[in-house]
């Protein structure tokens, strides 16, 4: 095909799993160059105004080459950088962090239940989010319904654009995502030693354009390559478009179709007017919502990464487009983080560590509002346990942008699944508010007093009431209302159509109307304004809390040195499911009042904790609490009972070091640790280190 070509062949050395920097770079250099040259081609095609189909093919090839480069970069990284997923998942399932939903009925893929530990962790991640964003920025939090009437999602573009192609096993009805299945099938064919160079080249070309194929092209490819169900070997149905939203009907009549929301954002846009009023009509302001969203993934296969019901936390920051400047940007300007700009991606470069202030100054990040949120997102993610070295912000390339966005940066984390998107930070421009305003005829705008009155050129539709009334009778009112709220950009576009073709079409409330020259013309005049109407731009940070949580699992999972069986999660104290454990060294009755007293005091201090008075050795009990990420451990030992003042030991999970302090002090120490007011190093500086028992009893708390 015209603008696609198989990615260049890998040097032999590329099969090695990890190597030194120079060796790795030697392997990556040709792949970087291949991306770069494809980037040049895309640019040239655009310059030459080549047909869109050719640009799309070239872009698909660019993305394919990018994927090859990225996969190789990941493969060349040191093996100890990658978590033992099987071991981690065993711990997560065994300790009931989460499990497949409806497990006793055989489970449903893409649906999960969180157990006590997972639930506590998730709540803490959400609570930290509230403090970090809602409280810090004085954001207006709302809670909207999940059920959404169809017209809302029609207007937002989700009904038309939120779809994938799907194929079905003709015998058992099992569904597969067409692109995923075709990709896996072609990769299998290509790995066959008997596959000729020409055939391989042809298949690579198909893979490169996978994102661009329409329904019929996909159907032909399934036939050409004889794709069958990978599970049963049965024939597959032709691909059909499958909308990823869960459809339902609101009310018993079945005449009000709706969907479970695919994102929480729409609820905020629809309440914009009320929120603006609540904010005394002033921009900028932000609104947020935390709640579940739903996507009917065709065949979810990646654990918590791809699910059908998931918790999102979304902020919509409404800003005057002429004032995209954040007063608090300086607070984050000195952060250094990995940025992977669109330019770097098409040049085959890696993400590069940059000071945020420099990134905005150099135009890598468009404005300080976007820059501020990127900085705050970074601080939040690292606060909850994501490793800064496995976190990058990747800018969407022009062709990847969602239908509503004009610039977008994703926070991506490096996991055993590769780089996964965990937060999207999109500049949605004025897409949503404009769409909903046009559909509902409710102007979703803010008013801004002008320093000086100004004379402006006005462009309006001037409809002929008579002609429209004659043509559309009782629907004429609909047409007139629609025409009254069209913006200048839209009017100018329609005027061009009117001049070129003598007519244009509008769509409102599900009805289509054709307007001809005798029904409408365009009026231009001047008027003096004292206030200015502003359609706010929207910066939207959107957090996938399940993916964040999964990343935290991977980035904090460790195996104790020298003991493969002892695993633990080093959750930061602020999100740890339990802040501390209370462990009596013995089941002796005289220990119990101290356990009770300490537990009650911890509760009074708001410190979630777990009492483990089971009979196992103290070392085994530490291991058990470490395994679920309990941040600290208080041990009531014989010295607690036998000596005054009554003291106990406090153990840090990560270093396994201990100090000794009075029982009465421990709740506030743990509370301060959990809130991040002090660090373990501060605690060690203030209290004596504890290295063994003083009473000579047989059972010690040394590990």
């Amino acid at each position: 095909s015209a603008a696609s070509c198989p990615p260049i062949s890998l040097p032999a050395a590329a099969s090695r799993s990890s190597m030194d920097g120079a060796g790795a770079e030697e392997v990556l250099a040709p792949l970087r160059l291949a991306v770069r040259q494809q980037g040049d081609l895309v640019r040239k095609l655009k310059e030459d105004k080549a047909p869109q189909v050719d640009v799309d093919k070239a872009v698909a090839e660019l993305k394919a080459r990018k994927r090859v480069l990225e996969a190789k970069e990941l493969a060349l990284q040191p093996k100890d950088d990658i978590v033992d997923r099987a071991k981690m998942e065993d711990t997560l399932k065994r300790r009931f962090f989460y499990d497949q939903a409806f497990a006793i009925y055989g489970g449903v893929s893409g649906l999960y239940d969180f157990g006590p530990v997972g639930c506590a962790l998730k709540n803490n991640i959400i609570q930290t989010w509230r403090q970090h964003f809602i409280q810090e920025e004085q954001i207006l939090e709302i809670d909207c319904t999940m059920l959404t009437p169809e017209p809302v999602l029609k207007t937002s573009g989700h009904v038309d654009k939120f779809a994938d192609f799907m194929v079905k096993d003709v015998k058992n009805g099992e569904c597969f995502r067409a692109d995923h299945l075709l990709k896996a099938h072609l990769q299998k064919l290509m790995s066959d030693k008997k596959c000729s160079v020409e055939k391989k080249s042809e298949m690579e070309s198909v893979l490169a354009q996978l994102d661009n194929y329409g329904q019929q092209e996909l159907a032909d490819l399934f036939v050409n390559y004889n794709v069958k169900s990978p599970i049963t070997g049965n024939d597959l149905s032709p691909p059909v478009s499958f909308n990823l939203m869960f459809k339902t009907f609101i009310g018993p009549g079945g005449n009000m179709p709706g969907y479970l929301r695919p994102e929480t954002a729409q609820g905020i846009f629809l309440n914009f007017k009320r929120l603006l009023e609540f904010n005394q009509g002033k921009l900028p302001f932000a609104a947020a919502q935390i709640g579940n969203s739903f996507r009917n993934e065709i065949s979810p296969r990646s654990g918590l990464i791809r699910v059908r019901e998931f918790t999102m936390a979304e902020i919509e920051h409404f800003v005057d487009p002429s004032e995209k400047d954040h007063p608090k940007f300086q607070n984050v300007a000195d952060l250094h983080l990995y940025l992977y700009s669109a330019k770097a991606q098409v040049s085959g470069q890696s993400a590069r560590k940059m000071r945020l202030g420099d990134a905005v100054e150099q135009g890598v990040i468009n404005n300080t509002v976007l820059g501020y949120f990127i900085g705050r997102i970074y601080l939040y993610l690292t606060k909850v346990g994501i490793s800064p070295d496995k976190l990058r912000f990747r800018q969407h390339m022009e062709n990847e942008m969602a239908h509503y966005a004009c610039d977008c940066w994703d926070a991506e984390s490096k996991t055993s699944y590769g780089w996964i998107e965990i937060v999207g930070c999109a500049d949605r421009s004025c897409y949503d508010l404009s769409c909903h305003a046009r559909a509902t005829k409710v102007p979703l705008v803010a008013e801004k007093p002008l320093k000086e009155p100004k004379t402006v050129n006005v462009v309006q539709f001037e409809p002929s009431k008579g002609a429209i009334g004659k043509a559309y009778k009782k629907d004429a009112k609909l047409v007139m209302e629609y025409l009254a709220i069209c913006d200048e950009c839209y009017i100018t576009e329609m005027e061009m159509l009117l001049n070129e073709k003598g007519e244009f079409t509008i769509e409102t409330e599900g009805k289509t109307f054709q307007l001809t020259k005798d029904m409408i013309n365009v009026k231009r005049f001047q008027k003096t304004l004292y206030v200015e109407e502003v359609v706010p731009n929207v910066i939207e940070p959107s957090f996938g809390l399940g993916r964040i949580m999964y990343t935290v699992f991977e980035h904090t999972f460790h195996v104790r040195e020298g003991d493969e069986q002892r695993t633990f999660f080093s959750f930061p104290a602020v999100v740890a499911p339990f802040k501390c454990s209370v462990l009596p060294l013995s089941q002796n009755q005289e220990f119990m009042p101290f356990v009770k007293e300490l537990s009650e005091a911890l509760t009074r201090h708001g410190v979630s904790h777990k009492v483990d008075d089971s009979s196992g050795s103290i070392g085994r009990r530490y291991a058990r609490t470490d395994e679920i990420g309990v941040a600290f451990g208080v041990t009531i030992d014989f010295d607690t009972v036998n000596k005054t003042p009554h003291t106990a030991t406090l153990r840090d999970r990560d270093s396994m070091r201990q100090i000794r302090a009075e029982i009465s002090e421990l709740p506030s120490i743990v509370q301060d640790l959990a809130n991040g007011n002090i660090t373990w190093a501060d605690v060690e500086a203030r209290y004596p280190l504890f290295e063994g028992q003083e009473t000579g009893k047989k059972e010690t708390i040394e590990e």
């Epitope: 015209a2 603008a3 070509c5 198989p6 990615p7 260049i8 062949s9 250099a29 040709p30 970087r32 160059l33 770069r36 040259q37 040049d40 081609l41 040239k44 095609l45 070239a58 160079v197 080249s201 330019k343 040049s347 470069q349």
Partner: antibody, heavy 116, light 110 residues
């Protein structure tokens, strides 16, 4: 309008050195990879060298490796080719061209003659 | 000795269609795009076809390119006297880590 203008050619003795320059205008020079291509009198085109937009990587033909050095100064919109240990077979018109595998704009060339 | 092989010469009468072939290997044409350049007498080369079959703006649609496997060809239909020039094919070569040209084909319009 995109323009590439080579300079610095001339007569040089075998073993000598020469530095060619290519002044670019009409496009964002710092956003493009650049190359040098040469053509011996009455012969075909031969690729010489290429450099990334940020100077991060350079490539050379085997025939010039170790003797020629490609570089650029984005603040001056200029591409350079430092040629050392010149040989008679390096005699050619040297062109600078935009990109590394899709030479969409070429300069008019500068003649380098290596002769004693 | 060029890495890509082109016939040294080709000819045709005005209005005729001529094709110029270019053959290489899996490390160049087989795995990368082919580009064609036109060099009119006494001038610098000019981009004629890129990405196997794309014409830059300003190049007449009489010129077309194609590629199959490890070979490529340039077709010129409706030959005109001003098409008399040297034509070069080129492609990036992955195993040489460099760009390679064909030896050039001198087209004569009779």
């Amino acid at each position: 309008e995109v323009q590439l203008l080579e300079s610095g050619g001339g007569l040089v003795q075998p073993g000598g050195s020469l530095r060619l320059s290519c002044a670019a205008s009409g496009f964002t020079f710092s956003g493009y990879d650049m190359s040098w291509v040469r053509q011996a009198p009455g012969k075909g085109l031969e690729w010489v060298s290429a450099i990334y937009s940020d100077s991060g990587s350079t490539y050379y033909a085997d025939s010039v490796k170790g003797r020629f050095t490609i570089s650029r100064d984005n603040s001056k919109n200029t591409l350079y080719l430092q040629m050392n240990s010149l040989r008679a077979e390096d005699t050619a018109v040297y062109y600078c061209a935009r990109n590394t595998a899709l030479f969409d704009y070429w300069g008019q060339g500068t003649l380098v003659t290596v002769s004693s | 000795q060029s890495v890509l092989t082109q016939p040294p010469s080709a000819s045709g009468t005005p209005g005729q269609r001529v094709t110029i072939s270019c053959s290489g290997s899996s490390s160049n044409i087989g795995s990368n795009y082919v580009t064609w350049y036109q060099q009119l007498p006494g001038t610098a080369p000019k981009l004629l076809i890129y990405a196997n079959n794309h014409r830059p703006s300003g190049v007449p649609d009489r010129f077309s390119g194609s590629k199959s496997g490890t070979s490529a060809s340039l077709a010129i239909s409706g030959l005109r006297s001003e098409d008399e020039a040297d034509y070069y094919c080129g492609a990036w070569d992955a195993s040489l880590s460099g760009y390679v040209f064909g030896g050039g084909t001198k087209l004569t319009v009779l």
